[in-house]
């Protein structure tokens, strides 16, 4: 090959300049002895370079572009060729930003897959390739000491979320947990969390049903509607507290709350309610009073309240 | 530090009834599931009855669905197992257990043995 | 119901040697798989929880593996009190069942 470019930095920020030598050999003896050389930056030639004869007889010029403002571009150094330019070298320049400090990093324990699960926000476009690495440690107290360092959770291309297996949990023990963001101009880290896995266990919401009617149990009052509850067997033994929700199916209404309900009570009379009307009602629960995360709604459960006008309106629970 | 101490084991006819207690200490215990495993003599662990912190849910083992009930006052800090319609092969030594919250069985008291003989 | 089934029955070994004892779930019972240790005329201590977690006070040479149906408890070199009989437990829901029980003895 008769020519080489290089440069000062083939990944800048961007906007800033570059600097760029082409240095074609003495043994190119078929092209002209005092050839010209021209700079091409994408499809738009550059004007600006500095050309000289070196001491052993090669040709080089060196140019600076001012501000790199393409995120990712070819610079080449060419010669008039007849009636064409003829290529010599070429680089791909590339600019962009160091990573922010990625955000918003938060933790799940989901004791069904048995794995904790983090996801956080990765910050602005970087417009580089920027890799993300969940990192984490075991501590026996508030993370100010650091025990065994635990396996580096990968995320894959483009996800802001990583599952550190169970293998690598220790459960009612405290662990470090960060992210750290990296790519060629730089290496950013996000603040540190401190948790006990269990602290941050979601658990899957109870099962709604309609409550059935026994022959010594009194009908639903009028305006009210009875229904229960079957756990999540895995959460069973967590202490827990539930709040239902429930609206007209028709209509605008919004949701109306009812809660707390400890999650034992099991089946629940709702009175206040419209009558011969058609309700939808969903669930859910969170450790209580240890800390954890409200579990997602759970399916709806449509019950329909009697016809005859409400004589009370009033929430109690049957034990 | 935990502690669980069982008692009102002892020799009863078959038929008979038999009350066991469980007294709970070191540990705040309306938080816990609290539970029953007995051991038959020469045999392996077999889980009989679990009590919810509150008292609301309680499952038993198929063997002895109807005939046993386990309650808890919390206000006393004991646990309860009320054994009726004894048959000789409820005889077994009767553990107390603390639960945690993934249903393991975390302390254990030192047992008392129940014997159903005529 | 679920089923839980340990191998071996029984095992003889030596001090110092690794010693792993297999239980198995009649259906997928996610990581809710407890070990415990019984030493004769004693009551029972629980050595794992949730397939991996050490209890606190029990030595680091015991280890849980496994999930879903199958679970290993690893005795990565038995010393002369560990020698006793072991039961695996499944609490991922009721009825609660233990496994038949492994009894460690010295060779």
């Known amino acids: 090959e008769c020519g080489h470019i290089s440069v000062s930095a083939p990944i800048v920020h961007l906007g800033d300049p570059i600097t760029a030598s082409c240095i074609i050999k003495q043994n190119c003896s078929h092209l002209d002895p005092e050839p010209q050389i021209l700079w091409r930056l994408g499809a738009e030639l550059q004007p600006g370079g500095r050309q000289q004869r070196l001491s052993d007889g090669t040709q080089e010029s060196i140019i600076t572009l001012p501000h790199l403002n393409h995120t990712q571009a070819f610079l080449s150094c060419a010669l008039n060729w007849g009636n064409s330019l003829q290529i010599l070298d070429q680089v791909e320049l590339r600019a962009g930003y160091p990573p922010a400090i990625p955000h918003n990093l938060s933790c799940l324990m989901n004791l069904t897959t048995s794995s904790l699960i983090c996801q956080w926000e990765p910050g602005p476009e970087t417009h580089l390739p920027t890799s993300f690495t969940l990192k984490s440690f075991k501590s026996r107290g508030n993370c100010q000491t650091q025990g065994d360092s635990i396996l580096d959770c990968v995320p894959k291309d483009g996800q802001s979320h990583c599952s550190i297996p169970r293998k690598h949990l220790l459960l009612y023990q405290n662990m470090g947990i960060w992210v750290q963001a990296e790519n060629a101009l730089g290496t950013s880290m996000s603040p540190q969390l401190c948790l006990d896995p269990m602290d941050v266990v979601k658990l899957e919401p109870p099962m709604l049903r309609t409550m059935d009617p026994s022959p010594e149990a009194a009908p639903p009052q009028a305006g009210c509607l009875q229904l229960s509850w079957e756990p999540w067997q895995p959460g069973l033994h967590i202490n827990q507290k539930c709040e239902l929700r429930h609206k007209p199916q028709r209509g605008e209404a919004s949701w109306a709350l009812v809660g707390p309900l400890p999650l034992e009570a099991l089946q629940y009379e709702l009175c206040g309610l419209l009558p011969a009307t058609a309700y939808t009602l969903q669930i859910r629960c969170i450790r209580w009073p240890l800390p954890g995360h409200w579990s997602d709604w759970s399916p709806s459960l449509e019950l329909r309240t009697t016809e005859r006008a409400p004589t009370h309106h009033h929430h109690h629970h049957h034990h | 530090e935990v502690q669980l101490l069982e008692s009102g084991g002892g020799l009863v006819q078959p038929g008979g009834s038999l009350r066991l207690s469980c007294a709970a200490s070191?540990?705040?215990?309306?938080?816990?599931?609290m539970g029953w495993v007995r051991q038959a003599p020469g045999k392996g662990l077999e889980w009989v009855s679990s009590i919810s912190s509150s008292g609301g849910v309680t499952p038993y083992a198929d063997s002895v669905k109807g005939r046993f009930t386990i309650s808890r006052d919390n206000s006393k800090n004991t646990l309860y197992l009320q054994m009726n319609s004894l048959r000789a092969e409820d005889t077994a030594v009767y553990y107390c257990?603390?639960?945690?919250?993934?249903?393991?069985?975390?302390?254990w008291g030192q047992g008392t043995l129940v014997t159903v003989s005529s | 119901d679920i089923q839980m089934t340990q191998s071996p029955s029984s095992l003889s070994a030596s001090v110092g040697d690794r010693v792993t004892i297999t239980c198995r779930a009649s259906?997928?019972?996610?990581?809710?798989l407890n070990w415990y240790q019984q030493k004769p005329g004693k009551a029972p201590k629980l050595l794992i929880y949730y397939a991996s977690n050490l209890q606190n006070g029990v030595p680091s040479r015991f280890s849980g593996s496994g999930s879903g149906t199958d679970f290993t408890l690893t005795i990565s070199s038995l010393q002369p009190e560990d020698f006793a009989t072991y039961y695996c437990q499944q609490s991922i829901g009721y009825p609660g069942s233990f496994g038949g029980g492994t009894k460690v003895e010295i060779k």
């Open positions: 259906q997928g019972i996610s990581s809710y």
């Open positions: 070191g540990f705040t215990f309306s938080l816990y599931w």
């Open positions: 257990a603390k639960l945690g919250e993934l249903g393991q069985f975390m302390r």
